[in-house]
Interface confidence: medium
């Protein structure tokens, strides 16, 4: 807390300018009017205030706006944003995408801080849903943003927003998140032709069910191994050797290198060994010839 001291003669700030960088903390507190600061916030970012001085400027704004800053001030916070706590930000009502962009720009190049996470949360909640423009903006600054959302939060993403998603945006998503995103992507891209569709849907396939993988195997898509390895194990297990061969095309040879890893390992255990042998890859671990395979799940469904 900065002590209240009288402003020295001739030091009263008439405007926010760079002469203030040589004011001591107590001088800033005493000589800068909070209302003046609020109306000239756009100048603060152009002045190389020290960290200590920014603390004082924040304190002045906090006193002026105890219930939270108005958006006209928030938009021009600049580096002062880095001084805000999540508690401060929870008091804000940010509705303009321009304001969001301006604040994200300040934090550019750094990992998502608790302040930024709170800001985004406030913004998205205020909008009611994660629209395309917002998603475009957020993933541009934080490629991993989508994967930081819970499945419940992702359910509010409209299919139209999926067009903004790039493959790298989904790198850290887990299967539960892809389960939510995949149906939205399927809906968003449904009018595209085969090869274009596959290019777009590929990143989301970690949420695809068996029937969609079977359908893709009929379309000569040549799925790469990296994508195959991210598929849901339960979706891969029912695929036949022929279907996997069609799905992977020339990439089928990569199965050998991945035979000890899921989902390939579990899939191998479900296939007849002589079917696996037709691939000519030396995959071992399939069901020996002559064994009867009972699909207990199917039997339960019938009874």
């Amino acid at each position: 807390e900065v002590e209240k001291t009288a402003c020295p003669s001739g030091k009263k700030a008439r405007e926010i300018d760079e002469s203030l960088i040589f004011y001591k903390k107590w001088e800033l507190e005493a000589c800068v009017d909070a209302a003046l600061l609020a109306t000239q916030m756009d100048r603060v970012n152009a002045i190389p205030f020290t960290y200590e001085q920014l603390d004082v400027l924040k304190h002045k704004l906090d006193e002026l706006y105890p219930q939270g800053y108005p958006e006209s001030v928030i938009q021009h916070l600049g580096y002062l944003f880095l001084k805000m706590s999540p508690e401060d930000i929870r008091k804000w009502n940010v509705t303009s995408l321009e304001t969001l962009k301006a604040l994200l720009e300040v934090n550019k190049g750094h990992e998502m801080s608790p302040q930024v996470a709170t800001l985004i949360d406030r913004f998205v909640k205020g909008r009611g849903q994660l629209d395309k423009d917002t998603l475009d903006t957020l993933t541009a600054f934080y490629p991993g943003y989508l994967c930081s959302l819970s499945p419940e939060e992702l359910s509010s993403v409209p299919p139209s927003s999926i067009w903004a998603v790039r493959p790298q945006d989904l790198d850290t998503c887990d299967p539960r998140q892809l389960d939510v995103l995949y149906p939205k992507a399927r809906l968003a891209f449904q009018n595209m032709n085969g090869s274009e569709y596959f290019v777009k849907i590929q990143s989301f396939l970690g949420g695809a069910p068996t029937e969609d993988l079977k359908a893709l195997s009929q379309q000569n898509v040549s799925m790469d191994l990296a994508t195959f390895m991210k598929l849901r194990t339960d979706a891969v297990l029912p695929l036949t050797v022929a279907e996997v061969q069609k799905l992977l095309g020339p990439h089928v040879e990569g199965l050998k290198a991945e035979e000890r890893h899921r989902p390939v390992r579990d899939w191998i255990l479900r296939q007849r060994q002589d079917d696996l042998d037709t691939l000519g890859l030396g995959l071992q671990g399939g069901i020996p010839n002559g064994y009867l395979v009972l699909d207990l799940s199917m039997q339960e469904a019938l009874s």
Partner: antibody, heavy 116, light 111 residues
């Protein structure tokens, strides 16, 4: 890459004058306040003076106030320190540095020796 | 006489953790951020820590800063021979005459 290169140091008699220069590159010079920090032989660091980005505001340590003048030419990306009425205790390596508290980049320094 | 007080020397063996203290007053460390600089013989100082405990990019996480009241400290863990240098603390000063004030420096020797 940020570069700060000082020049103008040398041997001067007590009461004499010297002008130090610091050529800056690799950043928008006019956007940054700049400072001079000195270090007497075998001693610690001492802040000397600072100037705002436009040059409109200056600040000095008590030990040099009235004798030293800091200035800058933003068109030449150059910082200056005009030193008058030099004393033997001004003998030091003078560093040009970016900022007014967080000195994030420093020049290699130029030696000023005040001796009769 | 420096306004901030540092021990003139400190030492440690490779791998050890060494701490350098910096003591000030309410007008500097007590009410402002602390900065630490590293200086090798014959070269310019380099910013090591700013805002009490923040490291600029490129500074190893073996270096950490902290502040409590009117004192601050720099800790170096996993000491290496290349850490042998002079270390200076600094802070803005809110007293009438001060602006930025430095400690006297600590010579760190790696045994």
């Amino acid at each position: 890459e940020v570069h700060l290169v000082e020049s103008g140091g040398g041997l001067v008699q007590p009461g004499g004058s010297l002008r130090l220069s610091c050529a800056a590159s690799g950043f928008t010079f006019s956007s940054y306040a700049m400072s001079w920090v000195r270090q007497a032989p075998g001693k610690g660091l001492e802040w000397v003076s600072a100037i705002s980005g436009s040059g409109g505001s200056t600040y000095y340590a008590d030990s040099v106030k009235g004798r030293f003048t800091i200035s800058r030419d933003n068109s030449k990306n150059t910082l200056y320190l005009q030193m008058n009425s030099l004393k033997t205790e001004d003998t030091a390596v003078y560093y040009c540095t970016r900022g007014v508290a967080t000195f994030d980049y420093w020049g290699q320094g130029t030696l000023v020796t005040v001796s009769s | 006489q420096p306004v901030l007080t540092q021990p003139p020397s400190a030492s440690g063996t490779p791998g050890q953790r060494v701490t350098i203290s910096c003591s000030g007053s309410s007008s500097n460390i007590g009410s402002n951020y602390v900065y630490w600089y590293q200086q090798f013989p014959g070269t310019a100082p380099k910013l090591l820590i700013y805002m009490n405990n923040q490291r600029p990019s490129g500074v190893p996480d073996r270096f950490s800063g902290s502040k409590s009241g009117t004192s601050a400290s720099l800790a170096i863990s996993g000491l290496r021979s290349e850490d042998e240098a002079d270390y200076y603390c600094a802070a803005r000063d809110d007293s009438l005459s001060g602006y930025v004030t430095f400690g006297g420096g600590t010579k760190l020797t790696v045994l």
